[in-house]
């Protein structure tokens, strides 16, 4: 049929909640472009009507809620005026019972479910709810340990809950709640969070710098092997991590199945009051649909990227 | 639709106290933080501290920390900021103000502001 | 305390022109969960402020498309495409990554 497969890294999901993901896969996204979800390679598409309890909404696939037997793999389709790209993302449904301890932890948990606070810092967790714009979400109450939290050290802002002057005493499990409201109907959405405390300095010391790249644009031709290291700069006892993303997906895990394009392996060189950090990225061919796509270098909470070009065309040869 | 009502101008001495009220209408009003912002004559914006009428929460400036008091009378949905031993400083415009939605910041709906002139 | 320190103090535009306003902060605003806790408002005489930009370059509701915003974890600029005799006011940048809320000084739009 035409269509570009890329394969998603597994999203691991708890039942009986809401659960939204957006297809999106930028440069192809911005442009004009339809999106149409199916699941487990159905010809049918998902339905689009609002009070079907899995459906489509804009670029969204949104369950209401999420069941047991939703697990399978999705597929959306992005169809351009000259290209198609089937995404295909696997997601698995598991039930967990937060406060509940006679059962095991969570699976494979993803960073949104692990969480670092610093010691002595002011700091704080964040409840990620990723819903599309029909979805209103109601106040947000956060648990430690199925006990509401409160008192003068925690402010609950937006998604956020602040933790001030963070103590040994604040790791544990949390929870989030938030209500979802969608056509007049409420659910729960509850999302649970491991908090392991570090007593180096990271986010919230000192900003790593990052030397190169600068956010600019690198004319490479089709086909060629490409090398681009990224260069940072960072105090001696911090905990960042140096990756590459694109389309906010770790490199290795965004070209899975082809391996084509590679984080490398990730060398410092230490100097009196820094180290300077060197991770690479590597283009083992560079094919079209590179082009025009911000390859971002991650240091803490610094970025930088880079942006594929072809040439352009040497009229000198003609 | 949201909107915030605050109380009428005043004229203090120094030393004396203002309550300002901001009366809520057109949300949930235990779901918000209210927030107050001042803004003294040829001076910038200043954050004093937010109001949460669930649970009388007030997380303040620290600048302002021994002078101002939020409370607030959930029947009327209106809270109150109340700003002790007044100085000549203090003349300015008070502004409460409401956050875009419970999970996006940004000040998106503020009361039409008090003027409070301290004055001997 | 997060500092926000705002260039130029004025500006005098004519209108049909752009114009650009910077903010930088003395920390990061850019947050582990890819969100930037910073935002624009508009402060008309006589009127309360307003809400232009949240999060960095989201365009606030009802905000006219001619206002954008951009920037890293330190560094922001408001950008008008084209100015009007309406945006004529003090330009404020603030931030929400923590307590307390802080504000720029201010930039004084005027048109020529």
């Known amino acids: 049929d035409g269509c570009k497969d890329i394969f998603m890294k597994n999203e691991i999901l708890s039942a009986s909640q809401p659960f939204a993901f957006n297809c999106t896969f930028p440069p192809i996204t911005s442009g004009e472009v339809s999106v149409t979800w199916y699941k487990n390679s159905s010809k049918i598409p998902v339905s689009k009507i609002i009070q079907s309890r899995i459906h489509q909404d804009e670029t969204w696939i949104l369950f209401l809620p999420m069941e047991w037997g939703d697990s399978g793999v999705y597929q959306c389709v992005i169809k351009g005026r000259d290209s198609c790209h089937r995404i295909h993302v696997n997601l698995t449904v598991f039930e967990k019972h937060w406060c509940d301890t006679s059962i095991g932890g969570l699976p494979n948990l993803s960073d949104e479910y692990k969480q670092i606070l610093h010691l002595g810092k002011d700091d704080s967790l964040t409840c990620h709810l990723h819903f599309p714009k029909s979805c209103v979400l109601g106040p947000i109450k956060w648990y430690k340990d199925c006990n509401e939290i409160k008192g003068e050290r925690f402010t609950v802002l937006e998604t956020r809950l602040l933790v001030s002057n963070v103590s040994a005493e604040d790791r544990g499990n949390y929870a989030c709640q938030a209500i979802l409201t969608h056509s007049g109907k409420q659910y729960e959405v509850l999302n649970g969070i491991t908090v392991s405390i570090t007593e180096r300095a990271g986010y919230g010391g000192s900003v790593p710098k990052i030397i190169y790249p600068k956010n600019h644009s690198i004319e490479v031709q089709l086909g060629t092997t490409l090398i681009v290291d990224c260069n940072v700069t960072d105090t001696k006892d911090n905990t960042n991590l140096r990756c590459w993303r694109v389309n906010n997906t770790l490199v290795d895990d965004y070209y899975d199945e082809s391996k084509r394009i590679r984080e490398g392996v990730e060398t410092h060189v230490s100097f009196r009051e820094h180290n300077l950090y060197t991770v690479n990225i590597t283009f083992l061919e560079v094919k079209m649909e590179d082009y025009g796509l911000p390859f971002m270098c991650h240091a803490g909470v610094s970025t930088a990227y880079i942006i594929l070009q072809l040439p352009a065309p040497d009229f000198r040869a003609y | 639709q949201v909107q915030l009502v605050q109380s009428g101008a005043e004229v203090k001495k120094p030393g004396a106290s203002v309550k300002v009220s901001c009366k809520a209408s057109?949300?949930?009003?235990?779901?918000?933080?209210m927030n107050w912002v001042r803004q003294a004559p040829r001076q910038g914006l200043e954050w004093m501290g937010m109001?949460?009428?669930?649970?009388?929460?007030?997380r303040l400036n620290q600048k302002f920390k021994d002078r101002v008091t939020m409370t607030r009378d959930t029947s009327t949905s209106t809270v109150y900021m109340e700003l002790s031993s007044l100085r000549s400083e203090d003349t300015a415009v008070y502004y409460c103000?409401?956050?875009?939605?419970?999970?996006?910041?940004?000040?998106?709906?503020w009361g039409q502001g008090t003027l409070v002139t301290v004055s001997s | 305390d997060i500092v926000m320190t705002q260039t130029p103090l004025s500006l005098s535009v004519t209108p049909g022109q752009p114009a650009s306003i910077s903010c930088r902060s003395s920390?990061?605003?850019?947050?582990?969960?890819?969100?930037?806790?910073f935002y624009w408002y508009l402060h008309k005489p006589g009127q309360p402020p307003q809400l232009l930009i949240y999060?960095?370059?989201n365009l606030a509701s009802g905000v006219p498309d001619r206002f954008s915003g951009s920037g890293s974890g330190t560094d922001f600029t408001l950008k008008i495409s084209r100015v009007e005799a309406e945006d004529v006011g003090v330009y404020y940048c603030a931030q929400n990554l923590e307590l307390p809320l802080t504000f720029g000084g201010g930039t004084k739009v005027e048109i020529k």
């Open positions: 109001f949460h009428p669930t649970g009388d929460v007030t």
């Open positions: 057109g949300y949930t009003f235990t779901n918000y933080w």
């Open positions: 920390k990061s605003l850019l947050h582990r969960n890819a969100i930037t806790y």
């Open positions: 103000a409401r956050t875009t939605s419970m999970i996006i910041g940004g000040f998106a709906y």
């Open positions: 999060q960095m370059s």
